[in-house]
């Protein structure tokens, strides 16, 4: 699946510049291409390493240029090699002296197994010496000096694969540098056959294309493309998709093209001769001008493309009528696709006429693996091939190539695939707290292995030996409810990134055990201040059915100072605890539970203030309202936290002695209003309100005045008091 081409310009070396260019056309191979000396074909050649450079005029090509060096440095056999999926594709070629005594008829010769073959060398220099012929450096044949013909031939009546190799010819007094070389390529199979046992019939390769004995595919000559090599490229272009161009002023003149075996080497279409510098004579076209035009309707014979058919006609001789063929085109393929590792179903869509079939559409992975469609359908104008890659992995990232090869031509479109690693948490989730039926879990997605961004998180949980359940979570802290008590649970987190199949493998598993169902909280809990620095918590005696030892855990917290918290363990046979070393005039919250090995259920919270260490402040917002001839409503508010135990309302008639006052003591500090009754009509009273706590009474700043209304006969005198 690699389009490797070696251009030998020129194979006959004189004192002019000569070069080798190796092109990996269309897409970048995984490993770099190399050019080297082919010592297998020719042992005794120069040992100096070649100076291989990048061919800047092409996207992916290497080049060796000899600038009029001594020809001995150049004479020899060469190869260009590219690797796909660890398999080497090697193209061979040769360079020899233009001043050699003999010259080969062709640089390479491809024959089928069993063919009757004549390998020919043309005598260029006449010498009174024997002529000798060697194969791969070993002597095979000599011709006495008086019998050396103008065309020196090696005759192989039944060519076999072992006959393949480099044949050289020279006079006996000559040497490597006066030798002429030609390479015989013998296809493993008889004519028009391919396959491991050569039983499969070849596609008929047109325009001198050669059927590959291992794949059955046509190797098309430079200037032709498509499944059968029927489609001619634009003049001066070559390559499997005709994307490469000869940059010379006369196109591909003086370029000898060498392709993978069994093709060998030839001129581009339109040229012939050992140096490919002779244009085809009239009526001939194709590589080495070996094809003859037989245009049906007297159409023009183009030396590059053959018969140029008029509208409505097609075929090599323009012998077929019908809809003109259209080179396939690849449609709607993005340049870059990001996919998640796992199953991947790339789609390749192509137009053209005839529409590509399933067998004509392939997908080439960066490592050279060729995929065939798994599913295929036609629409009105397109062929759609769906490929299946069961497990695409990050090493599969790189340039993939959608390739379509029909009788109407070939097209390849590379596109970049970036395979992302699915995210997986590196750590198990942390269990912050558990109860008998819940767990509080920290589900941090960081750190994770793989590629982000993280789109979603699933928390998987299960009791050991049961099936997994999951819940989608968004926050980092999550409470898992409705768990079974005293049960081993397993937890893990699955992360997902954007795109289809973005869910990663769940991360490491955390095990935890829910608590047993605890005992109920103590009953009859009461929290009362004991002193300025102590509170007393009491409860009813605790009886349990369990034989386990138990204790009461009391937790107290200051509501003012959040850091002030204390947990006290109280033996289970006690019914109270003194919470001491507290701060005066501070509110505390207290709760209790009964613990065995398992923790019990917490009680509701109780709140209480420690006794005050100062006099209470005066009641505030004192208002006197709803005044009648004998009653009035007094209301007030008190400030929390001063251990106020009672409110005293003191009132007296204006002008009366101080000791003639009446005190009303309200012992429920939560009462905030009181109705004075039994007042005299049309009388002015002075009213004071005090707050009383463990230290004493508050100091009123001033008295409030109240004047009752005139007597009203309707009002019934219910007397004083409450």
């Amino acid at each position: 699946a690699m389009d490797l081409i070696l251009i030998n310009s020129l194979p006959l070396v004189s004192d002019a510049e000569t070069s080798l260019t190796c092109i990996a056309s269309g897409w970048h191979p995984h490993e770099p291409i190399t050019i080297g000396r082919d010592f297998e074909a020719l042992m005794n050649q120069h040992q100096d390493p070649l100076e291989v450079t990048q061919d800047v005029t092409r996207e992916w090509a290497k080049k060796v240029v000899w600038k009029r060096e001594k020809a001995s440095k150049i004479n020899g056999a060469y190869f260009c090699e590219g690797r796909v999926r660890g398999q080497a594709i090697r193209i061979r070629t040769m360079k020899m002296r233009q001043q050699a005594s003999f010259l080969p008829a062709t640089l390479t010769m491809t024959v089928d197994r069993g063919d009757n073959v004549n390998i020919s060398f043309k005598k260029v220099l006449i010498k009174e010496e024997d002529a000798v012929i060697y194969k791969n450096g070993s002597f095979i044949h000599s011709v006495p000096r008086h019998e050396v013909p103008d065309i020196l031939e090696v005759h192989l009546p039944h060519a076999q694969p072992q006959d393949a190799g480099v044949y050289s010819a020279r006079y006996i007094g000559g040497n490597l540098f006066t030798s002429a070389f030609t390479r015989l390529i013998v296809r493993r199979c008889e004519a028009q056959k391919w396959g491991p046992d050569c039983s499969r019939p070849c596609t008929t390769c047109k325009n001198n294309g050669v059927c590959h004995e291992d794949t059955g595919e046509c190797i098309c000559p430079p200037g032709f493309m498509g499944r059968t090599c029927e489609k001619a490229c634009e003049p001066h272009t070559f390559g499997r998709t005709c994307k490469e161009r000869c940059s010379g002023p006369e196109g591909c003149k003086s370029y000898v093209f060498c392709l993978p075996d069994p093709y060998g080497c030839s001129c581009a279409t339109g040229w012939r001769g050992l140096q490919c510098n002779e244009a085809c004579p009239s009526g001939y076209y194709g590589p080495d001008c070996k094809l003859r035009c037989h245009c049906t309707n007297e159409e023009i014979c183009d030396r590059f493309q053959g018969c140029l058919c008029s509208q409505g006609w097609q075929g090599l001789q323009c012998e077929k009528e019908g809809r003109p063929r259209m080179t396939p085109q690849i449609e709607d393929l993005p340049d870059h696709i990001e996919v998640n590792s796992g199953k991947f179903n790339p789609i390749c869509k192509a137009s053209g006429w005839p529409l590509p079939t399933s067998e004509e559409m392939t997908l080439v992975k960066p490592d050279g693996t060729v995929l065939q469609p798994n599913d295929f359908n036609y629409t009105d104008r397109f062929s759609v091939a769906i490929f299946t890659v069961n497990r695409v992995l990050p090493p599969d990232s790189g340039v993939w190539v959608c390739s379509v090869n029909t009788v109407a031509g070939m097209v390849e479109k590379p596109f970049n695939i970036s395979v992302k690693v699915l995210p997986e948490p590196l750590h198990a989730p942390n269990v912050i707290d558990t109860g008998h039926n819940f767990a509080i879990i920290n589900i941090s997605s960081e750190p994770y292995f793989g590629d982000g961004p993280i789109k979603s998180k699933k928390l998987f949980y299960k009791p050991v030996n049961q099936a997994w359940k999951y819940i989608e979570v968004t926050n980092e802290i999550f409470t898992l409810n409705y768990l079974e008590p005293r049960t081993d649970y397993e937890l893990c987190v699955q992360l997902a990134r954007p795109g289809e199949g973005g869910e990663g493998h769940p991360g490491p598993v955390r095990r935890f055990t829910t608590a047993s169902i605890g005992l109920p909280p103590p009953r009859g809990l009461s929290l009362l201040p004991k002193s300025q620095t102590a509170l007393n918590l009491t409860w009813q005696p605790i009886f349990t059915n369990s034989e386990d030892e138990f204790y009461v855990e009391v937790e107290r917290r200051s509501l003012q100072t959040t850091s002030d918290q204390q947990n006290i363990k109280v033996p289970g046979n006690l019914t109270s605890v003194l919470l001491s070393n507290l701060v005066p005039r501070e509110q505390y919250t207290v709760r209790a539970r009964v613990n065995t090995k398992a923790q019990g259920e917490w009680s509701e919270e109780l709140r209480a203030w420690t006794l005050s260490d100062i006099l209470p402040p005066q009641p505030e917002n004192i208002k006197i309202s709803n005044i009648t001839d004998s009653t009035a409503m007094v209301s007030w508010t008190i400030v929390d936290g001063y251990s106020i135990s009672s409110i005293i309302i003191r009132y007296k008639v204006q002008g009366k002695n101080e000791d003639q006052h009446i005190d009303v003591k309200i012992k429920n500090a939560t009462v905030t209003q009181y109705q004075l009754k039994g007042l005299e009509p049309e009388t002015t009273y002075h009213v004071d309100i005090f707050a009383e706590n463990n230290i004493g009474s508050s100091n009123p700043a001033f008295s409030h005045e109240l004047r009752t209304l005139p007597h009203s006969p309707a009002s019934a005198d219910l007397g004083g008091g409450k």
């Epitope: 005794n44 002597f139 000599s142």
Partner: antibody, heavy 122, light 112 residues
Framework: EVQLVESGGGLVQPGGSLRLSCAAS????????MHWVRQAPGKGLEWVAG????????VYADSVKGRFTISRDNSKNTLYLQMNSLRAEDTAVYYC???????????????WGQGTLVTVSS | DIQMTQSPSSLSASVGDRVTITCRSS???????????LDWYQQKPGKAPKLLIY???NRASGVPSRFSGSGSGTDFTLTISSVQPEDFATYYC?????????FGQGTKVEIK
């Protein structure tokens, strides 16, 4: 004109060293293997050493092995023979010769230099 | 090493005579193909040797046709069909089958 010109001969004491050179012209020097052949006064020819066109193959006569070194510089079209630990029996005219081959096989020496005399004596 | 033995060590001939020199090797010089790895050289006094025949029977460029080489295996012959004044010299055979390359001791052809 095709020619080989030796230089560097002379009188040297036993155990001494000498370096012979052979300058080539008129042909493509690095197309061919090269050799040194010597001839003791009034005696026959004796092959001394040979070197292939690219110095890939070098061979010596047993009588000089370990003492003489043949080398070539293709960029200068020159062949060399470094002679160490010279003995009286090394006294001879030393010829450089061009092979018709590029390797040391099927040798034939079609071009010879005029020779340079090496005398080893105390 | 391969030993090369020439005979005679010297001979006298008149101009126009047919001269034959033989050379025997201690082992066969016939290679796997039909060529024998043996060369013949001519040396005149005070001059460098000159190649006459290579690979047993192939005349070197510029060598007159009166010189010919023959023989195979271990026995070889250099023949001068009609000796000329310029042919009086010493002739050496040399084997090239294996290194070290070895010469015969020489055959001196003198004017009678």
């Amino acid at each position: 004109e095709v020619q080989l010109v030796e230089s560097g001969g002379g009188l040297v004491q036993p155990g001494g060293s000498l370096r012979l050179s052979c300058a080539a012209s008129g042909f493509t020097f690095d197309d061919y293997a090269m050799h040194w052949v010597r001839q003791a006064p009034g005696k026959g020819l004796e092959w001394v050493a040979g070197i292939s066109w690219n110095s890939g193959s070098i061979v010596y006569a047993d009588s000089v092995k370990g003492r003489f070194t043949i080398s070539r510089d293709n960029s200068k079209n020159t062949l060399y023979l470094q002679m160490n630990s010279l003995r009286a029996e090394d006294t001879a005219v030393y010829y450089c010769a061009k092979d018709i081959r590029e390797q040391l096989v099927e040798d034939a020496f079609d071009i010879w230099g005029q020779g340079t005399l090496v005398t080893v004596s105390s | 090493d391969i030993q090369m033995t020439q005979s005679p060590s010297s001979l006298s001939a008149s101009v126009g005579d047919r001269v034959t020199i033989t050379c025997r090797s201690s082992q066969s010089l016939l290679h796997s193909h039909r060529y024998n790895y043996l060369d013949w050289y001519q040396q005149k006094p005070g001059k460098a040797p000159k190649l006459l025949i290579y690979l047993g029977s192939n005349r070197a460029s510029g060598v007159p046709s009166r010189f010919s080489g023959s023989g195979s295996g271990t026995d070889f012959t250099l023949t001068i069909s009609s000796v000329q004044p310029e042919d009086f010299a010493t002739y050496y055979c040399m084997q090239t089958l294996q290194t070290p390359l070895t010469f015969g001791q020489g055959t001196k052809v003198e004017i009678k």
